[in-house]
């Protein structure tokens, strides 16, 4: 029989018959090592490769460029997949992005983008998006016209300030923009009036820090 092809992403995993959410190993084009990722097989038809997850504040997201480049955390809990991996995956084929959010009152919402990819490291992992829909606000809380990735040691934003230092975490800051899902985790009761929290402006406003977030991608032709 034909030799089995390695999984490029969680869509391949799903289409191979593995339809339970969990950790799987994928083989990304141009990456020397396989990568363990969390695959969400439940939301909106499944096949989603999780690139970011926040849920309990157990992981420090205030990290430098190199760590955001290669990723940190554990796919079984809180983690950032790594910009180099996100770039490599989204260079394989066309992807959509879905962001699942939950506030401290238990309200859930999502934002979805028909097209998502990021540039390479030389391009500061610049964000490219098209076609926003969802329940987490009529307007997009991610910069649609493109923004470079910034960290505490790499200031690539459009502000006279240093957004990543001020708002914490690495993100596609503008000046500083309407979102930051890699900000400080604040617990219930402490999550209001926070400049540097986990923010999705058009869902909960400029200074509400969210309880949980998941960023996940899936091929357009899934």
């Amino acid at each position: 029989r034909e030799e089995e092809k390695p999984f490029r992403d969680c869509a391949d995993v799903y289409q191979a018959g593995f339809n339970k959410s969990g950790i799987y190993t994928i083989y990304i084009n141009n990456m020397p090592e396989p990568k363990k990722v969390f695959c969400n097989m439940d939301v909106n038809g499944g096949g989603w490769t999780v690139i970011q997850h926040r849920e309990d504040g157990s992981l420090d997201f205030q990290r430098g460029w190199k760590e955001y480049k290669m990723g940190f955390g554990n796919p079984s809990g809180e983690y950032w997949l790594g910009n180099e991996f996100i770039f490599a995956i989204t260079s394989q084929r066309q992807y959509m992005l879905r962001i699942e959010l939950m506030d401290w009152e238990g309200n859930r919402a999502y934002s979805q983008y028909d097209r998502f990819h990021i540039g390479n490291e030389k391009q500061n992992y610049r964000l490219y998006l098209k076609g926003h829909t969802g329940t987490a606000g009529k307007q997009s809380s991610l910069i649609l016209h493109g923004a470079d990735f910034s960290t505490k040691d790499a200031d690539n934003d459009n502000c006279m300030c240093k957004c990543a230092l001020m708002l914490t975490g690495g993100w596609w800051f503008d000046a500083c923009g309407p979102s930051n899902l890699n900000g400080m985790f604040y617990t219930a009761g402490q999550n209001h009036g926070k400049l540097n929290g986990i923010k999705w402006h058009y869902f909960k406003g400029p200074s509400y820090s969210l309880r949980s977030t998941t960023m996940m991608i899936r091929p357009l032709d899934f």
Partner: antibody
Framework: EVQLVQSGGGVVQPGRSLRLSCAAS????????MHWVRQAPGKGLEWVSY????????YYADSVKGRFTISRDNAKNSLYLQMNSLRAEDTAVYYC???????????????WGQGTLVTVSS | DIVMTQSPLSLPVTPGEPASISCRSS???????????LDWYLQKPGQSPQLLIY???NRASGVPDRFSGSGSGTDFTLKISRVEAEDVGVYYC?????????FGQGTKLEIK
């Protein structure tokens, strides 16, 4: 390049009106809160008024409340200050100023206009 | 309204020497989110003010590293490690923690 170009100043009699304008360019105007700050001749700076990015939130200093009206036209990238019932003590250079951060996060003024002189005198 | 008090009001400095300006507020400027909304602005002769330091200690882009801000609560300081001729002008502190924003009366830095 961020630019705030002001116009509309001049000499006006007490009790009369004047409208100041501030034309913005080089940034997404509709994403930023905007302010008016004034400086009486030889004096320090005094905050006058604030309008949020969408125009839904507005604040005034007590000294101008009920007389001045701040407004914005995001389609025209413009900020305005309508000044009615002007008094001698309103004589000052008026500056428009942009929030440092977008989306109505307050951290001070990142950019200032060149200023326009309003003289209230009979 | 919060009263901001600067000292000294006049500061003659020899080029190359350090300079320090104090700013005190009538109430604490430490916001519940952990930030001190205290900015420093420089108004050079005949010009509009320009931002030097935001949120107490963060230098704005393009501001030389000889400028530094420090302090928390009610006491803040702007330091210039080595004054240059281009630093002349009036320095203002401004608080934005409590509405309305209020400015200090200004400190005039001049070259000896």
């Amino acid at each position: 390049e961020v630019q705030l170009v002001q116009s509309g100043g001049g000499v006006v009699q007490p009790g009369r009106s004047l409208r100041l304008s501030c034309a913005a360019s080089g940034f997404t105007f509709s994403s930023y809160g905007m302010h008016w700050v004034r400086q009486a001749p030889g004096k320090g700076l005094e905050w006058v008024s604030y309008i949020s990015s969408s125009g839904s939130t507005i604040y005034y200093a007590d000294s101008v409340k009920g007389r001045f009206t701040i407004s914005r036209d995001n389609a025209k990238n413009s900020l305005y200050l309508q000044m009615n019932s002007l008094r001698a003590e309103d004589t000052a250079v008026y500056y428009c100023a942009r929030d440092l951060l977008d989306y109505d996060i307050w951290t001070g003024y990142g950019y200032w206009g060149q200023g326009t002189l309003v003289t209230v005198s009979s | 309204d919060i009263v901001m008090t600067q000292s000294p009001l006049s500061l003659p400095v020899t080029p190359g020497e350090p300079a320090s300006i104090s700013c005190r507020s009538s109430q604490s400027l430490l916001h519940s989110n952990g930030y001190n909304y205290l900015d420093w602005y420089l108004q050079k002769p005949g010009q509009s003010p320009q931002l030097l330091i935001y949120a107490g200690s963060n230098r704005a882009s393009g501001v030389p590293d000889r400028f530094s801000g420090s302090g928390s609560g009610t006491d803040f300081t702007l330091k210039i490690s080595r004054v240059e001729a281009e630093d002349v002008g009036v320095y203002y502190c401004m608080q934005g923690t409590h509405w309305p924003p209020t400015f200090g009366q200004g400190t005039k830095l001049e070259i000896k």
